[in-house]
């Protein structure tokens, strides 16, 4: 018998049922690799609890239709009075990634799954070239599911202090280059998940091969690796890699772009921070209110709901869509169909379509965005259930009292797509959100700028136009609202830019929208502030022009006008300039932008090494130096010793070179001991040092080698910059 | 909330031993750098002995081959096994975990050596 859905077969996959504490294994075409359960058992149960495994379906005894898949087993159970036999049932619809099964419920004798994937769709246009699954369990049976971050079409650009190339990556799976508009990624070819462009060229240097893993607490990693056998003119002989490391941040915050953090001999080490690595429950709920203290957020959106018949409608072109939120649409034409979403064409009004019901609902929050997801509507011809996906955008001043109203933004394969601005999607403050802005491969970063909390001061800026007697202040932070402290006390509490005289405080806006890259400088416009009279509220832009080597200098207030509806501050600053690449000698480093100065000659040791042990090696290591060990040659900066016979490798000749990108401090040592393989390629090390106000000198910690490059981390206060 | 609390530090005399404890609630000690640091009045504090979630170890210059530094993930619990112990180990000793959100310290437990 042919395995129903064979894109499923290559993996052993995961179900929990949280209420029980309890962790399902299946594999759907063979069986699960757990003795406890049997050699032929495709749906293992393991009750944590109990600590108990039980099978509770056996690969021998499947039957399968286009959407179900059933197995049976030999083991006898009482249902109302009937003697049954105990079976998993797993229910299949059409999704646009591999999915994940998820645990609906279970009675005595039946234990029912669902699982939306590519695999149960009537038409291959979801379909991977190659795809893993994207989600795991935690020891906590928490599911952390980066299937939201996959994309169905083009790629993430990965940040990166190389002009010349540019890495792109997709999540889980390959990038699907033919439904792309970006002609960069055209040339990428089929099958890669990262696809270096250089030039006009493109490269595959990753696919998928292994499922998402947890290394530890909100750390997960994927790995890609390039099947061919051809190697790569400009990888030395070297198979490349990519590693993706997940984040999960511990506080609420935008989505950060992946980000670089290690590049030898194309192994591409990749950290991105993202609230999609956090586990599910932070993220997701049910209902129509979402709170999660871990990202301080609170969200309730029942006063959107309508009531009495009403619906809110938005017009498709082709169709008008009816809307409820947090219950069904009331509308005639849609009666009896429990859709939260309902789709009427124009030119026929007979002609119906559930888009989404209301009792299949998710609300999600995840990296800044606040998203609504209706699903199991009425089928299309592809097989896939018709969804609805509603972004929401926080807007204090929406009409229709604060509600607003849901606009069409387009439909994708079925999915139809909405945008939301209303006060109900307000997540307390953006705070530490998008403060920074992207030039094409520039970045600019303006959290340098960013005061927190006290004992640190707002800034203020300069106004030389008054005197003394009508002095006004102007306080301002950076991506944050102002802090209550000072002559700002009495400053409205999530104003991010405050005016304050002697007749009181004045809003001069608030941090609702990220800085813009405009005419060469950093545009931050602050909104939405007091009322100036005619019903408009006062609004402030401020211009930042780069100026390298200056954190200190505040902000000048250039002009204000339109009654005082509107202020105008251009501000010199390091923080405005593009971050950029910097090489040094003799231990140190200059970031010339930022006017950060890194001297790290205190951790070279004068005699002797530090010395990192493992269970088969101790690594010795030097800063800027050699290695004063033996058996270590004299010129090394590091070297690895073999507990067992005490052989020597030389993993690089010492040099003070220093590199400094973006907050990261890495210094190379190359030209050690070759391997013994076909290129003789020479051992190097990479250490990457990483600020770390409390840890002094701070030590070297081996994080692994990859192929021919010995990586260590290495926090310590000296890489902290000093604080202006 | 994350806790680290020390415990074992006592007075005992040179070339004695002692095994300090850290035990550690709010956090998976398995899955961090860990390690015991050491201070002595007027003088920042040092590290003796770190271990990272990938079992490689660290030692400082003077205390290599006499401490040792373990834990037991499933207690959640970092030892420090001080052997041939002097008087110029005498320090308060803190247990420190290093995660992605910021670093955490234990109060300290006093070991003096006489």
């Known amino acids: 018998q042919a395995a129903p859905f064979p894109e499923l077969c290559s993996y052993t996959w995961e179900a929990v049922d949280t209420k029980n504490n309890v962790l399902y294994k299946i594999n759907i075409c063979g069986s699960v690799d757990i003795v406890q359960c049997g050699p032929s058992s495709a749906v293992c149960m393991h009750d944590l609890k109990t600590r108990t495994y039980h099978s509770v379906g056996d690969s021998v005894l499947r039957s399968a239709t286009r959407s179900l898949l059933e197995f049976n087993t030999t083991v006898s159970c009482d249902q109302q009075g009937t003697n049954h036999r105990v079976q998993s049932s797993i229910a299949f619809l059409c999704g646009k990634t591999l999915g994940t099964p998820e645990f609906v419920t279970a009675t005595e004798c039946v234990h029912y799954f669902e699982w939306r994937t590519t695999a149960a769709c009537k038409k291959d246009i979801f379909k991977a070239n190659k795809e893993v699954p994207c989600y795991v369990f935690d020891e906590e049976l928490r599911k952390h599911d980066l299937n939201p971050l996959i994309k169905l079409s083009g790629a993430y650009l990965v940040d990166d202090s190389d002009p010349d190339t540019s890495l792109f990556i997709n999540v889980c799976r390959d990038i699907d280059t033919l439904r792309d508009p970006g002609s960069q990624l055209r040339a990428c070819p089929p099958g890669t998940a990262a696809c270096l462009v250089r030039g006009h060229q493109a490269f595959d240097v990753g696919q998928p091969r292994d499922g998402l893993k947890l290394v530890r607490k909100d750390r997960l990693v994927l790995s890609y690796v390039r099947e061919e056998a051809g190697k790569l003119d400009f990888c030395d002989g070297h198979s490349p890699a990519v590693t993706i490391t997940f984040v999960c941040p511990s506080e609420r915050r935008e989505g950060t772009i992946p980000k670089l953090t290690a590049k030898s001999n194309c192994r591409y080490e990749i950290e991105w921070i993202t609230e999609y690595a956090c586990h599910r429950d932070y993220l997701e709920s049910k209902t129509c209110s979402l709170s999660g203290e871990q990202q301080d957020v609170s969200i309730d959106l029942t006063p959107l709901a309508q009531s009495g018949g009403s619906s809110y409608i938005s017009d498709g072109k082709e169709y008008l869509f009816y809307l409820n939120v947090c219950g069904e649409t009331e509308i005639q034409f849609c009666n009896k169909k429990q859709a939260a979403v309902c789709q009427v064409k124009k030119s026929d009004t007979s002609q119906v379509k559930a888009a989404g019901r209301y009792h299949n609902q998710t609300l999600r929050y995840s990296d800044g965005d606040l998203t609504l997801i209706y699903f199991g509507g009425d089928e299309c011809s592809s097989g896939f259930q018709r969804m609805s996906v509603i972004n929401f955008e926080c807007n204090k001043t929406a009409g229709n009292d604060g509600k607003g109203t849901p606009v069409f933004t387009g439909e994708v394969d079925c999915t139809y797509f909405f945008t939301w601005d209303t006060e109900y999607a307000c997540v307390k403050e953006k705070e530490d959100l998008l403060c920074g802005a992207t030039d094409g491969k520039k970045r600019y970063d303006l959290s340098a700028l960013v005061r927190h909390a006290e004992p640190e001061q707002n800034w203020e800026a300069v106004d030389g136009s008054q005197t003394e007697t009508e002095k006004k202040h102007f306080f301002i932070n950076i991506c944050h609202r102002v802090l209550q402290e000072g002559k700002a006390r009495g400053c409205p509490e999530d104003a991010a830019v405050c005016a304050v005289d002697k007749n009181g405080s004045k809003n001069l806006g608030k941090f609702i929208s990220s800085p813009m890259k405009e005419k060469g400088n950093i545009q931050l416009s602050y909104s939405d502030g007091d009322d100036c009279g005619h019903g408009k509220k006062i609004k402030t832009n401020i211009t930042l022009v780069c100026k390298p080597g200056d954190l200190e200098s505040a902000p000048v207030l250039r002009t204000s006008g339109e009654g005082g509806c509107f202020y105008e501050f251009e501000w010199h600053t390091a923080a405005a300039c593009v971050l950029s690449k910097t090489e040094g000698e003799n231990c140190t480093v200059f970031d010339s932008q930022a006017g950060f100065s890194f001297d790290l000659s205190p951790l070279t040791k004068k005699n002797g090494a530090y010395k990192v042990e493992t269970k088969k090696y101790d690594f010795y290591i030097n800063v800027c130096g050699p290695v004063s060990v033996s058996p270590c040659q004299p010129d090394s900066g590091a070297c690895q010793v073999a507990k067992s016979d005490e052989k020597t490798w030389n993993l690089g000749l010492s040099n003070a070179k220093l590199s400094y990108y973006d907050g990261m401090i890495q210094l190379n040592y190359r030209g050690g001991t070759p391997y013994n393989n076909e290129r003789h390629t020479p051992r190097a090390t990479l250490i990457t040092f990483l600020c770390d106000r409390d840890a002094g000198v701070g030590f070297p910690e081996y994080q692994e080698e990859d192929n021919s490059t010995y990586n260590f981390r290495w926090y310590t206060s000296y890489a902290c910059p000093e604080e202006p | 909330e994350v806790q680290l609390v020390e415990s074992g530090g006592g007075l005992v005399q040179a070339g004695g031993s002692l095994r300090l404890s850290c035990a550690a609630s709010g956090i998976i000690f398995g899955a961090n750098t860990v390690g015991w640091y050491r201070q002595v009045p007027g003088k920042e504090r040092d590290v003796v002995a770190s271990?990272?979630?990938?079992?490689?170890?660290y030692y400082g210059d003077s205390v290599r081959g006499r401490f040792t530094i373990s834990r037991d993930n499933a207690k959640n619990t970092m030892y420090l096994q001080m052997n041939s112990l002097k008087p110029e180990d005498t320090a308060i000793y803190y247990c420190?975990?290093?995660?992605?959100?910021?670093?955490?310290w234990g109060q300290g437990t006093q070991v003096t050596v006489s």
């Open positions: 420190r975990a290093r995660t992605t959100d910021g670093s955490y």
């Open positions: 271990i990272t979630s990938g079992d490689s170890t």
